[in-house]
């Protein structure tokens, strides 16, 4: 016997209290799939997160960070501080990369140069705190 | 007991106004998010309008922004939806709405009246 809910397309949701019909999702609430019980909240992209996309009944809202910030985290559940090129973030904040590394992005963490005598090379050019040496012949 | 009673429809010709009432009892209507749906004949529901998060923002189908505007009266537990520039398209059985969030995250509604006749027609 086919569960009548399953006729319930996506942005609505079978209605126990009204036989089972189908039922728009209310403000604010979406669902993705046909045959649910329920709506799901929308994802309000609040303080450092804006919105890059609005909910809808039938899809979800979804974020990204506001300036200054980058996501993380599967579907930007994070928003992390942006350093500048040559810096890193700690706990104190941005930081200068160290000696002897460097960080070409607004984010992530310094990493060493290459070290060119591993590969037989010489440095061709040094490396500086925004980017890696260059090895050459 | 959760009970919504809605009055106020009636005869209108277009361009005309109606103001729909929705007296709540078994809940308090200025501390959750309540609205109103409509059923115009042959279709199914559609929301029309709603109060959200306790009062801070409100929301209007595109079908309907800029001629209704949502209301409460706290100290009454009443809900109104203020229609106006009415249309032949409006006319449907109108109920009040307590939105319901469920522990698991999970969204629905409440409709506990027996709606209000709105008839637009010249």
């Known amino acids: 016997l086919q569960d009548p809910c399953s006729n319930c397309p996506a942005g609505t949701f079978c209605d126990n209290n009204r036989n089972q019909i189908c039922s728009p999702c209310p403000p604010n609430s979406f669902s993705s799939a046909g045959g649910q019980r329920t709506c799901d909240i929308c994802r309000q992209c609040k303080g450092v997160f804006r919105t890059r996309k609005e909910c809808s009944s039938t899809s979800n809202a979804e974020c990204d960070c506001t300036p200054g910030f980058h996501c993380l985290g599967a579907g930007c559940s994070m928003c992390e501080q942006d350093c500048k090129q040559g810096q890193e973030l700690t706990k104190k904040g941005c930081k200068d990369c160290c000696f002897g590394t460097f960080n070409d992005q607004k984010r992530g963490i310094c990493r060493p140069w290459t070290n060119c005598s591993l590969d037989g090379k010489s440095v061709l050019v040094n490396g500086t705190k925004e980017r890696d040496v260059v090895c050459g012949p | 007991e959760v009970q919504l009673l809605e009055s106020g429809g009636g005869l209108v010709q277009p361009g005309g106004s109606l103001r729909l009432s929705c007296a709540a009892s078994?809940?308090?209507?200025?501390?959750?998010?309540v609205g109103w749906v409509r059923q115009a004949p042959g279709k199914g529901l559609e929301w029309v309008s709603a109060i959200l998060d306790s009062g801070g923002s409100t929301y209007y189908a595109e079908s309907v922004k800029g001629r209704f505007t949502i209301s409460r009266d706290n100290a009454k537990n009443t809900l109104y939806l203020q229609m106006s520039s009415l249309r032949a398209e409006d006319t449907a059985v109108y109920y009040c709405a307590r939105i319901v969030y469920h522990a698991g995250g999970g969204v629905t509604f409440d409709t506990r009246g027996q709606g209000t006749q709105v008839t637009v027609s010249s």
């Open positions: 078994g809940f308090t209507v200025s501390a959750e998010d």
